[in-house]
């Protein structure tokens, strides 16, 4: 309500995330992610739970496939409303390759820099969403260690959709995505049966991210 007692349209976060966090979401945008609007719906549900601002939580988004695109930087938007609008407009960039190590490494080296809005002394969180084994998995171990060395907390989400569509074994894929997650794995790793099911993990994921502030 405004000072003149008029209703002001605003989005109140479902659960306030008022302590500072710098969160970079790393999205697999390869063709096999289908349908894409399941990803944007997931983003919407997750982001609306956050209290976003220059002195609160900041969010940046990186999309990868064959190469990497910074969709927006940590300091690009200063409110939850602005971030929600921007996230809804993110288009799938496509490609057949899933360069997960490249995506994570780019997020670490570029998205989490002060030039892109990262704040000194603020906890760094990375959320990685992917649906397939990486084409650069020989690099993953080092890339994850580099994140570990920089105290970047990692939540990883394995979408099993393309495996289930092709009746393929998910074992190797799940192991890879588990290896990306911070310890303890059971608190940092999620898997969903398909893209449509992404929204079902938002509440738990949100709670676990907020728990990092304690």
């Amino acid at each position: 309500v405004s000072p003149t007692f008029q209703v002001v349209n605003s989005i109140a976060p479902v659960q306030e995330c008022s302590t500072q966090l710098d969160i970079v979401i790393v999205l697999d945008g390869s063709n096999s992610i289908y349908p894409w609007d399941s990803v944007t719906a997931f983003l919407n549900d997750l982001l609306k739970r956050m209290d976003i601002g220059p002195k609160q939580t900041q969010v940046g988004i990186v999309q990868y496939g064959e190469n990497v695109t910074h969709e927006f930087n940590l300091n690009k938007y200063s409110s939850t409303e602005e971030v929600l609008v921007a996230a809804k407009k993110i288009v799938q960039r496509g490609g057949r390759q899933t360069m997960t190590a490249l995506g994570i490494d780019t997020a670490r080296k570029e998205a989490f820099t002060e030039a892109r809005g990262a704040r000194r002394g603020v906890k760094k969180v990375m959320v990685i969403v992917t649906d397939g084994e990486s084409h650069d998995n020989h690099r993953l171990k080092k890339v994850i260690q580099d994140c570990e060395d920089e105290n970047i907390q990692r939540f990883s989400i394995a979408i099993l959709g393309s495996y289930n569509r092709g009746n393929l074994s998910t074992e190797k894929f799940v192991e890879e995505i588990k290896s990306i997650a911070s310890e303890p794995t059971e608190k940092h790793f999620f898997n969903v049966s398909d893209e449509l099911a992404l929204v079902t993990i938002v509440k738990t994921l949100g709670e676990r991210i907020f728990a990092l502030e304690a």
Epitope: S30, Y34, G95
Partner: antibody, heavy 124, light 108 residues
Framework: EVQLVQSGAEVKKPGESLRISCKGS????????IGWVRQMPGKGLEWMGI????????RYSPSFQGQVTISADKSISTAYLQWSSLKASDTAMYYC??????????????????WGQGTLVTVS | EIVLTQSPGTLSLSPGERATLSCRAS???????LAWYQQKPAQAPRLLIY???RRATGIPDRFSGSGSGTDFTLTISRLEPEDFAVYYC?????????FGQGTTVEIK
Amino acid sequence: EVQLVQSGAEVKKPGESLRISCKGSGYSVTSYWIGWVRQMPGKGLEWMGIIYPGDSDTRYSPSFQGQVTISADKSISTAYLQWSSLKASDTAMYYCARLQGDCSGGTCYGHFDYWGQGTLVTVS
Amino acid sequence: EIVLTQSPGTLSLSPGERATLSCRASQSVSSSYLAWYQQKPAQAPRLLIYVASRRATGIPDRFSGSGSGTDFTLTISRLEPEDFAVYYCQQYGTSSWTFGQGTTVEIK
């Protein structure tokens, strides 16, 4: 803005060869599959085949396998549909369309979200 | 391959009326991978609905899709003059794409 622009109408004689084109713009053309769809006069839509311009991986509908060739030149963001010997029954409107989805590992799925304006091919 | 049968072949209605178009598959369509397209004379098809019920970008909310398994429906809640066209359903859950034969929605 995503656009698929097809080559102009063609009038050919039976036995002649033909190649029609579909040029994509406004998106990363090498990163999305492009499909071809036939519509014979007064009839419905038939899927012919699909190509990934990034590496020219191609899949055909069994009904069109061996009847047509689908190719692409990624350097100019263009997909092609060609015939080596046209028949009167090839008279139709041909559309290209971008696939929102994938066709990897033997499994294809997805919808066609953007379409070209169509190329009318008349064989008589 | 999955055969899609659309009914009715032709639907004669007046502007403002509700249109209900049916698409029946010869076997279950996996993951509800069914789309609907609209085609007007001398124009390319236009995507309306995908994954059975999701509206494509820019499609008015008078268009809605529903169904799963073998039975799918496209509903136009209130026909506008520009909605008179041919509508095709398409399945894409079997590593190939097949279309229904189309339903023509014409002005009564």
